[in-house]
């Protein structure tokens, strides 16, 4: 499989936002790339978000997605928002070179994202 | 060396409090035990806190210590408070069986404590 690198650990901010870079070693000159973020917890894998982009263009996630991102060459800067403590888990970056053929696939080792719920602020009375 | 077990990762609460258990395999029936918490960051090791206790009694840290703890058999429940994001690091549990002889020493593999600073609460005006 294609090599995909991502950080081992990231801490979400107290606002529940986590950002990390997913970098892939492209064998060739792909023009269409698909990036998917998967969450693995208790051996269950679920899709968090996905975006297909043309090289040189912006990543476009669905409007209701919790992810945003930008791309630069073979690097994708991913941001996941709205995270709560229960969302702590291993977030895996999957990269697919969709066009031109052939198809190449790479899976990162995952980024362990830790999320701590903030203490509620005291009532202002 | 004596075997010492501690968790690999702990998240500090949003209030900057982290707790973990340090468990040691005692070769004999020690009556006096010393527990030290060391912090390793950038290959520098510093002492965070230390307490000597008699088996069956409470751990007593110094009054100005950021640590508190309780013991139960060969387990020590450690709590570190007042942590900030800059305190993120590897916290190593060191256990010494001081009395009766012979002296035994054990060092854990360390607990990576992650600390996220909370967002300030909005002014109540």
């Amino acid at each position: 499989a294609m090599h995909v690198a991502q950080p081992a650990v990231v801490l979400a901010s107290s606002r529940g936002i986590a950002s990390f870079v997913c970098e892939y070693a492209s064998p060739g000159k792909a023009t269409e790339v698909r990036v998917t973020v998967l969450r693995q917890a208790d051996s269950q894998v679920t899709e968090v978000c996905a975006a297909t982009y043309m090289m040189g263009n912006e990543l476009t996630f669905l409007d209701d997605s919790i992810c945003t991102g930008t791309s630069s060459g073979n690097q994708v800067n991913l941001t996941i928002q709205g995270l709560r403590a229960m969302d702590t888990g291993l977030y895996i970056c999957k990269v697919e070179l969709m066009y031109p053929p052939p198809y190449y696939l790479g899976i990162g080792n995952g980024t362990q994202i830790y999320v701590i719920d903030p203490e509620p602020c005291p009532d202002s009375d | 060396a004596m075997h010492v077990a501690q968790p690999a990762v702990v998240l500090a609460s949003s209030r900057g409090i982290a707790s973990f258990v340090c468990e040691y395999a005692s070769p004999g029936k020690a009556t006096e035990v010393r527990v030290t918490v060391l912090r390793q960051a950038d290959s520098q090791v510093t002492e965070v806190c230390a307490a000597t206790y008699m088996m069956g009694n409470e751990l007593t840290f110094l009054d100005d210590s950021i640590c508190t703890g309780t013991s139960s058999g060969n387990q020590v429940n450690l709590t570190i408070q007042g942590l900030r994001a800059m305190d993120t690091g590897l916290y190593i549990c060191k256990v010494e069986l001081m009395y009766p002889p012979p002296y035994y020493l054990g060092i854990g593999n360390g607990t990576q404590i992650y600390v996220i600073d909370p967002e300030p609460c909005p002014d109540s005006d």
């Epitope: 064998p27 060739g28 894998v45 053929p101 198809y103 696939l105 | -």
Partner: antibody
Framework: EVQLVESGGGLVQPGGSMRLSCAAS????????MNWVRQAPGKGLEWLAQ??????????YYSASVKGRFTISRDDSKNSVYLQMNSLKTEDTGVYYC??????WGQGTLVTVSS | DIQMTQSPSSLSASVGDRVTITCRTS??????LNWYQRKPGKSPKLLIY???NLASGVSSRFSGSGSGTDYTLTISSLQPEDVATYYC?????????FGSGTKLEIK
């Protein structure tokens, strides 16, 4: 038009050697990982070997059935990939295909190992 | 190595039938699965890549689905020209093995 043309097949005795060649055209050869796949008579497709490209330091991978006997290589200046087959066995008989990461395939070349 | 279990090994169906072939892997391959069609005397032809994507020039009668360890190739309305052997392949592994094949015939 993409083309992959295998050559070098034929009849060889057990224990013998043979070198297969695959000439590619119509696509950027150096951008691709190249593979050899075979089909033995009455059997299914069997992946044999893969050679990656320059960004992957020309890493090679082999199936357990051919490791130590077969060697895959490539020459990007000639748009060609090769399979050197040594210590051939009767069970190596089949049609050998070269493929550019399974998107493009050659027409195959028949290798018969028999005494 | 990842094991590929393809079923059935053969099947016979009528023209117009909906046909499904399944492939199960011994571990999660994250959608890294291709499907091929091989007709006698011809080279294998890529039908589906990445579990769900239709290869260029392939009829929309063919579709792929699945994730994790379970994958399916579906032919929505079987045609006489679909008589062939179909193979799944794991493309995630460094050793991209094939399934054992499914021989499809017309009743």
């Amino acid at each position: 038009e993409v083309q992959l043309v295998e050559s070098g097949g034929g009849l060889v005795q057990p224990g013998g050697s043979m070198r297969l060649s695959c000439a590619a055209s119509g696509f950027t050869f150096s951008d691709n990982w190249m593979n050899w796949v075979r089909q033995a008579p009455g059997k299914g497709l069997e992946w044999l070997a893969q050679i990656r490209n320059k960004p992957y330091n020309y890493e090679t991978y082999y199936s357990a059935s051919v490791k130590g006997r077969f060697t895959i290589s490539r020459d990007d200046s000639k748009n060609s990939v090769y399979l050197q087959m040594n210590s051939l066995k009767t069970e190596d008989t089949g049609v050998y295909y070269c493929t550019a990461q399974f998107a493009y395939w050659g027409q195959g070349t028949l290798v018969t190992v028999s005494s | 190595d990842i094991q590929m279990t393809q079923s059935p090994s053969s099947l016979s169906a009528s023209v117009g039938d909906r046909v499904t072939i399944t492939c199960r892997t011994s571990e999660n391959i994250y959608g890294g699965l291709n499907w091929y069609q091989r007709k006698p005397g011809k080279s294998p032809k890529l039908l589906i890549y990445g579990a769900t994507n239709l290869a260029s020039g392939v009829s929309s009668r063919f579709s792929g689905s699945g994730s994790g360890t379970d994958y399916t190739l579906t032919i929505s309305s079987l045609q006489p020209e679909d008589v062939a052997t179909y193979y799944c392949q794991n493309v995630l592994s460094s050793r991209p093995g094939f399934g054992s094949g499914t021989k499809l015939e017309i009743k």
